[in-house]
Interface confidence: low
């Protein structure tokens, strides 16, 4: 054998007796007829020598060493090669060692090629007898990273101040590559980073430096992981000790991208978290040791990427080909920011495409699924246009506003439906009829359904909310001038089983100038609570608003305001109330910036309640709240 | 609906070369990783390679090592196998198969003979 | 390579029947072991996936357990479509995969 070392290549090459075996027979590296048991050749030299053995591989070891110094020069990164080649060397079990030493401001990155490493923990090997040992610096202290086989997740490792790694190779095996490249980095302001990808299942077992010895004193070691947001990753810690801390508190800290809680703070003795969809970090915080009895701290962790387990196996189908200018989102709904873990909630399209946020348009047939420990953090919104550009067309042509099926089928709480109606301006209004009569929700009476509707004008300048309604009320139609929004909110899960209430018809009706008009047919068992559209922020300036109210013929009407004044005052323009009886047409004018509303008053017949606004001065809005309640003619009413 | 469909298979004289083909629909070969299974006659199953279209990963079996490559073209939807230096014991229907919930799909098989 | 040791290579067995398949692996494979059925000129079908985990679509008759390296797939009331050849498989660490050796269940 031959062994030629270039100068100033700061390799240097040792063989050496390897483990002692039970071989009879010793074997020797011969040198110009010279026996010897160690042999070590330097840069520039070049040595000839043979073994005394047919099978040096038995006895002999080989180990490469090049210094790589980036204190003094420029550091050679790229792809580190193997040097000298392996064909040049002897068949030995053969030890690649590279020392890097650099300043502690340069973080320095190993970079794996396919096949990713894999750690070991104390008295494992790898199957393949290829093993590689990576070790960091403190100061003068060397700091064991960990031993890694192949075929395993971890791509990079970073670490700053230094890096030895060493590459075992078995005698028979072909390697010739390093299979890792170096590449210079800013500081890491930590000991390590190790990068583990994950390409699909799988698991992977980790350890904090110098396992199972303790961990550096007031250290951080981080951990990122790479996951397919398809997939969810659980950690679970196979071994840990603590150590006597003095000052700061020995901890895991979790990082995880769009998380709004981030770090997530974790003791080593509690439940990890599961469940985790995508990418994340893991860190290891030391402590400030007790000098006296410092104790170790000591972390074995595994990381288990999976598949999520039932709901997500589902596929739900939405169709929505046969609708038009729809759109349905699946997203987050709002919690209360807590430091406590949450693990991720996703929704996912054709299984592939992972988010938490997702929205489906109309048009087209969707296929989807959810990787979620618990759905009832997601929730779907849907919103509709119905549009009329045509008033020829469209005039008393209907709408039924239903949710349909698809929707409801899905494992996902419904919270808002919301229709667009628009028509074309001063040319059509629209009225809303529902299947069941509705109930304006008051403080007074709220409605306690599982959903309820609520109204309000789609006209971007316009501030008008009319009210929430929800099914067993009174009012019977709502008219309304112009452009709405429909939006039906669910408050409860038991919107699946009242699903069959829901039912309201929109129809294009001619326009009308009234911003809104309410149909009442009050029952005779219960009071009618009314009051007027954008209660607590006033009915928007120079509004008008009527409610048509039935009384049956064998009955009264008692209608009753809940304060002695409006409490509007206007700046331009006057605010008033009409009660007008529809039979006789007779009427009753009130100015609500001025006068005291009325008593209550009994009506025999049908009447009209119409309020107008004026200009009000900010802070003195028109807000009025009146009841309706019907009582048999038979009643003596004097 | 998913489908894998191979085609290329034939009778090949040892030395000679072959290219199979697997063409996927009702999925997108991105995500998922490919696979070749190979069946000789009235024996068992034996995997030959995988690709991950979306890592470029390729992988191989000890016994076809250096003779055969697998690719995919994404922009097609289809894997390949390209088979160098085919041997008599090489004779074996291939399956493709997608790799998700372990291999959960395979095409129908191509019958490969390497015979003089 | 993981090996993955299958038994019986085949056996006899009637409609109803309970029947049980094992695959024991050479050194740890978690639970990734997939189980197939194949019929005479078919391409293999998955039944069972993460050693215990129903593919979709596959009856409820089929099963998957593990216990350390050993996985045992049971058929718990035998059909007349049952009968077939069964494969295990396992894909730890993704490659190389490696299947067992197959059983074939054939009508007593």
């Known amino acids: 054998f031959e062994i030629a070392l270039p100068r100033e290549s700061n390799i240097t090459v040792l063989i050496k007796l390897g483990t002692p075996t039970l071989l009879a027979k010793p074997c020797y590296i011969v040198i110009s007829k010279r026996h010897i048991t160690m042999l070590s050749i330097k840069s520039g030299e070049r040595i000839v020598f043979t073994f005394s053995c047919q099978s040096p591989e038995n006895h002999f070891v080989i180990e490469i060493q090049k210094n790589i110094d980036c204190m003094s020069g420029p550091c050679p990164f790229g792809e580190v090669q193997l040097q000298p080649s392996t064909s040049l060397l002897p068949t030995l079990n053969r030890t690649f060692i590279w020392d890097v030493k650099a300043h502690k401001s340069i973080g320095l990155e190993l970079q794996f090629s396919i096949p990713r490493l894999r750690q070991i923990g104390p008295g494992e090997s790898c199957p393949d007898g290829v093993t590689h040992s990576i070790s960091g610096r403190i100061d003068a202290t060397v700091v064991r990273i960990g031993t890694f086989c192949s075929n395993g997740t971890v791509s990079r490792i970073k670490m700053q101040e230094g890096v030895k790694m060493a590459l075992h190779l078995p005698w028979f095996h072909p390697r010739n590559v390093s299979g890792f490249s170096i590449a210079n980095r800013s500081s890491i302001k930590r000991l390590c980073i190790i990068e583990s990808v994950f390409e699909g299942e799988g698991s992977a077992t980790l350890m904090s430096a110098n396992y199972p010895e303790g961990f550096p004193e007031d250290e951080l070691m981080t951990w990122q992981f790479v996951v397919p947001a398809h997939l969810r990753a659980s950690v679970s810690f196979l071994n840990f000790n603590l150590s006597n801390c003095e000052r700061k508190e020995e901890r895991v800290e979790y990082y995880i991208p769009g998380s709004t809680t981030n770090p997530e703070v974790f003791k080593l003795e509690d439940k990890q978290p599961g469940n985790m969809a995508g990418n994340f970090n893991l860190s290891l915080q030391g402590c400030d040791q007790d000098a006296q009895s410092p104790g170790i701290l000591r972390l074995q962790f595994q990381v288990l990427v999976q598949h999520p387990q039932n709901e997500s196996n589902k596929i739900y189908v939405v169709d929505l080909s046969n609708e038009r200018a729809m759109s349905l989102t699946i997203e987050p709904r709002p919690v209360k920011q807590s430091r406590k873990f949450v693990p991720g909630c996703f929704v996912c399209l054709e299984s592939r495409t992972c988010s938490s946020n997702l929205t489906l348009t109309s048009g087209s047939k969707h296929k989807i699924s959810f990787l979620c420990d618990d759905l009832t953090r997601l929730w779907m919104n849907v919103e509709k246009t119905i549009s009329c550009t045509d008033h020829r067309y469209c005039q008393r042509k209907s709408y039924s506003l239903q949710v349909p099926s698809d929707i409801l089928h899905l494992p996902v709480e419904l919270h808002d439906f919301s229709w667009k109606l628009l028509v074309p301006k001063d040319r059509l209004s629209l009225v809303l009829v529902p299947a069941q009569k509705l109930q304006q929700h008051t403080h007074e009476k709220p409605c306690n359904t599982s959903f309820s509707y609520l109204v309000a004008s789609a006209i971007p300048s316009q501030d008008l909310y009319f009210g929430s309604f929800c099914p067993g009320g009174s009012i019977k139609q709502i008219q309304v001038k112009q452009n709405i929004s429909v939006t039906l909110r669910t408050f409860a899960p038991s919107f699946q089983q009242e699903a069959s209430r829901q039912g309201l018809t929109v129809s294009f009706i001619p326009y009308f100038k009234e911003e809104g008009v309410f149909t009442v047919t009050p029952d005779t068992k219960s009071k009618v609570y009314l009051r007027t559209p954008n209660w607590d922020r006033g009915l928007p300036s120079l509004t008008s608003v009527s409610w048509n109210i039935s009384v049956p013929r064998d009955q009264v009407a008692c209608l009753t305001f809940f304060k002695e004044r409006s409490g509007v005052v206007c700046q331009t323009g006057r605010a008033f109330m009409i009660i007008q009886e529809q039979r006789t047409r007779a009427e009753e004018i009130f100015s609500l910036d001025e006068d005291v509303l009325p008593k209550p008053s009994f009506h025999h017949h049908s009447f009209w309640v119409n309020i107008s606004n004026c200009s009000p001065t900010s802070g003195k809005q028109l807000d009025l709240l009146f009841s309706v309640t019907l009582t048999p003619r038979t009643v003596d009413l004097t | 609906e998913v489908q894998l469909v191979e085609s290329g298979g034939g009778l090949v004289q040892p030395g000679g070369s072959l290219r199979l083909s697997c063409a996927a629909s009702g999925f997108n070969i991105s995500y998922y990783s490919m696979h070749w299974v190979r069946q000789a006659p009235g024996k068992g199953l034996e995997w030959v390679a995988s690709i991950s279209p979306y890592s470029g990963y390729t992988s191989y079996a000890d016994s076809v090592k250096g003779r055969f490559t697998i690719s995919a073209d994404t922009s097609k939807n289809t894997a390949y196998l390209q088979m160098n230096s085919l041997r008599a014991e090489d004779t074996a229907v291939y399956y493709c198969?997608?790799?998700?919930?372990?291999?959960?799909?395979w095409g129908q098989g191509t019958l490969v003979t390497v015979s003089s | 390579d993981i090996q993955m040791t299958q038994s019986p290579s085949s056996l006899s067995a009637s409609v109803g029947d309970r029947v049980t398949i094992t695959c024991r692996a050479s050194q740890s494979v978690s639970s990734a072991v997939a189980w197939y059925q194949q019929k005479p000129g078919k391409a293999p079908k998955l039944l069972i996936y993460s050693a215990s985990s129903l593919y979709s679509g596959v009856p409820s008759r089929f099963s998957g357990s593990r216990s350390g390296t050993d996985f045992t797939l049971t058929i718990s009331s035998l059909q007349p479509e049952d009968f077939a050849t069964y494969y295990c498989?396992?894909?730890?660490?993704?490659?190389?995969?490696?299947f067992g050796q197959g059983t074939k269940v054939e009508i007593k």
């Open positions: 198969a997608r790799g998700y919930y372990a291999l959960d799909y």
């Open positions: 498989q396992q894909y730890y660490y993704f490659y190389p995969f490696t």
